[in-house]
């Protein structure tokens, strides 16, 4: 409504608002305000939100439902919960992927993209923390592998291979000359 006034409504409960002649009750979640009430403290005409729109608030006076968000496929997002008349689509990442926020101060409504989780097994490492809200945290090398540089190297299977000190400590034998 135009103007800046917000007249007080002498109606039972706090969910009334002056719309034209009368103070009208608000609409329930999942509905939008189609027509004002036609008597004091009366019920507004409220209709169910059309498909692909929603309104999450109770006792509101919104005349339009909000459009449901579409999950960003370019950012590898998927719908964890589909949109309903009372709740927006909940976007997230599919199993094996984690949320990477696109802003430094990350909140639930911040833009994000999905990154594939690190596969510790493929790196021949123990999984210390499973990937969900952040990337997988990999631990030490799996049995039969030893630390070499940034990676895990397979223990030699024959005495012909070289086995530095760290290899020997993990793999349990020294190179023979």
């Amino acid at each position: 409504q135009g103007g800046t006034r917000s007249p007080r409504c002498d109606c039972a409960g706090d969910f009334h608002k002056k719309i034209g002649l009368f103070c009208c009750r608000g609409c329930p979640a999942g509905h939008y305000l189609k027509a004002p009430c036609t008597e004091p403290c009366g019920n507004s005409t409220c209709l169910v939100c059309p498909q692909d729109t929603f309104l999450a608030w109770e006792n509101h006076h919104n005349s339009e439902c909000a459009r449901c968000q579409a999950c960003d496929e370019q950012a590898s997002q998927v719908a964890l919960e589909n949109c309903s008349a009372v709740a927006d689509t909940r976007c997230g990442c599919k199993p094996g992927w984690f949320v990477e926020c696109q802003v430094s101060q990350c909140v639930s409504s911040s833009p994000f993209y999905c990154q594939p989780c690190l596969d510790c097994g493929a790196l021949h490492r123990h999984t210390r923390l499973l990937c969900s809200r952040r990337d997988t945290d990999c631990g030490t090398c799996l049995p039969g592998f030893y630390e070499h540089g940034d990676g895990c190297v397979s223990c030699p299977t024959s005495t012909l291979g070289s086995c530095p000190e760290r290899c020997a400590a993990v793999c349990g034998w020294r190179q023979m000359f």
Partner: antibody
């Protein structure tokens, strides 16, 4: 299409009574509030009375309070105005008018969107 | 009661002229204002609701503006069929009240 057809006007003596009718068609009469508005000869428009769709809310202008009675019969799609103790100053063309309201784009609107053809009441 | 003061009470203009009518409420009525057109011997017709919204089927030469206590009704280019009396009406409060009307004539 929406139509409001009025009847019941005429000449009446001061102190007399008259009943105006307004027959509605082309819309769901029981869903709308209705009004009576009058216009004295050569004068402007004056609101007379309001009745909600279910008849639970009724209002009158001070000038007719206690003398006029608005009513409706949703089964017959009809609106009425019973006028008693008529005075010379009640002489006017009386209109019935539908009160419509709707909300869109963050605002709500109300107004008399359809009117009857009018019926002349002469008190003399 | 909310008093609606409309001016001028009458005006005469040429075809094609811009015509402006003002309506002043005795208190803040927000946007709760309608404009009606009444041709001689006919019932009024709703032209503009909520101060500035054109009713369906009404020519775009008609417009309205304003909020609070002051509202304006404009005919951008007067046509012979616009000869009528125009009324503003508030619906902020009961009783519903109309302005005194503005009679528009062609020179």
């Amino acid at each position: 299409q929406v139509q409001l057809v009025q009847s019941g006007g005429g000449l009446v003596q001061p102190g007399g009574s008259l009943r105006l009718s307004c027959a509605a068609s082309g819309f769901t009469f029981s869903s709308y509030s209705m009004n009576w508005v009058r216009q004295a000869p050569g004068k402007g428009l004056e609101w007379v009375s309001y009745i909600s769709s279910s008849s639970s809310t009724i209002y009158y202008a001070d000038s007719v309070k206690g003398r006029f009675t608005i009513s409706r019969d949703n089964a017959k799609n009809s609106l009425y105005l019973q006028m008693n103790s008529l005075r010379a100053e009640d002489t006017a063309v009386y209109y019935c008018a539908r009160w419509d309201g709707y909300c869109s784009g963050g605002s709500c609107y109300s107004g008399m969107d359809y009117w009857g053809q009018g019926t002349l009441v002469t008190v003399s | 009661d909310i008093e609606m003061t409309q001016s001028p009470s009458s005006l005469s203009a040429s075809v094609g002229d811009k015509v402006t009518i003002t309506c002043q409420a005795s208190q803040d009525i927000s946007n709760y204002l309608n404009w009606y057109q009444q041709k001689p011997g006919k019932a009024p017709k709703l032209l503009i609701y909520d101060a500035s919204n054109l009713e369906t089927g009404v020519p775009s030469r008609f417009s309205g503006s304003g909020s609070g206590t002051d509202s304006t009704f404009t005919i951008s280019s007067l046509q012979p069929e616009d000869i009528a009396t125009y009324y503003c009406q508030q619906y902020d409060n009961l009783p519903l009240t109309f302005g005194g009307g503005t009679k528009v004539e062609i020179k």
